[in-house]
């Protein structure tokens, strides 16, 4: 009878993570008597995957009944494959011996490659907010994919970005890989509703890329513009001074009225109106009793927005002139500030 040969018909097998890998192996003879063992890798450091003779291998099942003497099919199935299972698997026939079984013949090996999906991309922006015209960096990370080939694109509101750098690690062979990309984005005042999208395409995704998003509302700070105006009210001796705070984001804002440099009232923006671009407007007003003043009054609207240094706008109220002739007559929406008389 011809000497036994161990045949592994598949040079390579490609399996998706989570699935079952079938590693085929047949022997050409029933002689000699002795166990089959499967190893991952070769040489002294090889890892035992299955031993027909003894041991417990919960992830491994045999394709045929290996308990029988007449069996020559030593194929195995390995369940719940992960990228860590990638490698070359050898089917090895041993001859029954004493005191140990003796390695008799090895198959040529089957390379198991594992296709693993990338994790959902995670996009993170800068730690601190930035204002329009500034350039900010966004990072995108995805892990655990195999094979190494992967495509990453950046978009802002559907428009592809070009200013980014991408790395796939590690550079050499590995069971799985990670991708890291940094994109630079120039902010504009209209970016409150904008989104930055990181899109990852991989062979395991079958043409349906994964996306990670970041809302620029988490990144942008649009500082307000201030306008202080004056208009008369019903009583001839009262003047209504308004401070219009426009186009700011985020909403966190504190306003202080100063009369000749002295704090008159402080309030926090509450009932704001939202603009189409996502920024906010707010108005505060002050009722000034001009009859109580002999000298001109300098009124200042001071705004502290989102923890930034205060910005202010002043208005000189001339008490000598008739109130109707002072300042702008622009009507402003009353958004509910408390009346304040100056005595």
């Amino acid at each position: 009878e011809e000497e036994l040969q161990v045949i592994q018909p598949d040079k390579s097998v490609l399996v998706a993570a989570g699935e079952t890998a079938t590693l085929r192996c047949t022997a050409t003879s029933l002689i000699p008597v002795g166990p089959i063992q499967w190893f991952r890798g070769a040489g002294p450091g090889r890892e035992l995957i299955y031993n027909q003779k003894e041991g417990h291998f919960p992830r491994v099942t045999t394709v045929s009944d290996l308990t029988k003497r007449n069996n020559m099919d030593f194929s195995i199935r390995i369940g719940n494959i992960t990228p860590a299972d990638a490698g070359t698997y050898y089917c090895v026939k041993f001859r029954k011996g004493s005191p140990d079984d003796v390695e008799f013949k090895s198959g040529a090996g089957t390379e198991l490659s594992v296709r693993a999906k990338p994790s959902a991309p995670v996009v993170s922006g800068p730690a601190a907010r930035a204002t329009p015209q500034h350039t900010v960096s966004f990072t995108c990370e995805s892990h655990g994919f195999s094979p190494r080939d992967i495509t990453l694109k950046w978009f802002k509101n559907g428009n592809e970005l070009s200013d980014f750098q991408t790395n796939v690690d590690p550079v050499g062979e590995s069971v799985s890989y990670s991708i890291h990309s940094t994109a630079k984005v120039v902010l504009t005042r209209e970016d409150v509703h904008s989104q930055v999208i990181c899109e990852v395409a991989h062979v395991t995704l079958q043409g349906d890329p994964l996306r990670g998003t970041a809302n620029l509302s988490e990144t942008i700070r649009v500082p307000p513009t201030l306008e202080v105006t004056q208009q008369p009210v019903r009583a001839e001796n009262q003047v209504n001074v308004t401070c219009q705070v426009r186009k700011f984001y985020p909403q966190r804002l504190q306003l202080t009225w100063l009369e000749n440099g002295n704090v008159s009232r402080t309030e926090t923006a509450s009932t704001v109106t939202e603009n189409k671009d996502g920024t906010y407007n707010w108005m505060s007003w002050l009722l000034v009793n001009v009859s109580a003043h002999r000298d001109d009054v300098k009124l200042t609207c001071q705004v502290e927005h989102d923890g930034q240094p205060a910005v202010s706008k002043s208005h000189d109220l001339k008490v000598s002139a008739h109130p109707k002739e002072q300042g702008s007559n622009t009507a402003a929406e009353n958004t509910g500030s408390n009346e304040r008389n100056i005595y």
Partner: antibody, heavy 118, light 107 residues
């Protein structure tokens, strides 16, 4: 269903010969090692001989040169030719299949009695 | 030849008991050890092979363990049908050899 049926046992005088047969069915005979095991009345089991798939044969010293194991795969049959029989060879002779991947004995026949006596 | 020594030679036990039979080889047999059960007037029946593998169709109350030269057969909960004679056998090296047997009797 695996079946092993021994035949050929009987009474024989010391120095005489006997040929035991084992008819196998229910499996692919040529793909299995086969063995003979005997048991004297009230005693333990003693392995007598074995034959491999390729026809390689094995014996203990107690029967070497006197017993010959053979197989005829075409007839699904195993034989044990016993010569120069001694009273100490008196026993029930079992045919067994080396059916385990490792040659372990998984199926046994019901046995045939050999009595060596004058 | 490799000598196989079984102990005890006989054993009395009750239904429901857990019993252990030991088998010692005179040299390392590389776990090529089988256990058989034999009832009077019947052929031996294979229980365990390769020291610990249960033969197909054998109830899991039978278990084998050990390695090298020392092996055990354990019956976890004796039933009336388990009272019989038990043999170990090494099949690592020709000539194959059996232990002398352990007779398990009802107490």
């Amino acid at each position: 269903e695996v079946q092993l049926v021994e035949s050929g046992g009987g009474l024989v005088q010391p120095g005489g010969s006997l040929r035991l047969s084992c008819a196998a069915s229910g499996f692919t005979f040529r793909s299995y090692d086969m063995d003979w095991v005997r048991q004297a009345t009230g005693k333990g089991l003693e392995w007598v001989s074995g034959i491999g798939i390729a026809g390689d044969t094995y014996y203990p010293d107690s029967v070497k040169g006197r017993f010959t194991i053979s197989r005829e795969n075409a007839k699904n049959s195993l034989y044990l030719q016993m010569n120069s029989l001694r009273p100490g060879d008196t026993a029930v002779y079992y045919c067994a299949r080396g059916g385990g991947w490792d040659g372990s004995l998984d199926y046994w026949g019901q046995g045939t009695l050999v009595t060596v006596s004058s | 030849d490799i000598q196989m020594t079984q102990s005890p030679s006989s054993l009395s036990a009750s239904v429901g008991d857990r019993v252990t039979i030991t088998c010692r080889a005179s040299q390392d047999i590389n776990n090529y050890l089988a256990w058989f059960q034999q009832k009077p007037g019947r052929a031996p029946k294979s229980l365990i092979y390769t020291a610990s593998r249960l033969q197909s169709g054998v109830p899991s109350k039978f278990s084998g363990s050990g390695s090298g030269t020392d092996f055990t057969l354990t019956i976890s909960s004796l039933q009336p049908e388990d009272f019989a004679t038990y043999y170990c056998q090494q099949y690592n090296t020709y000539p194959y050899t059996f232990g002398q047997g352990t007779r398990l009797e009802i107490k």
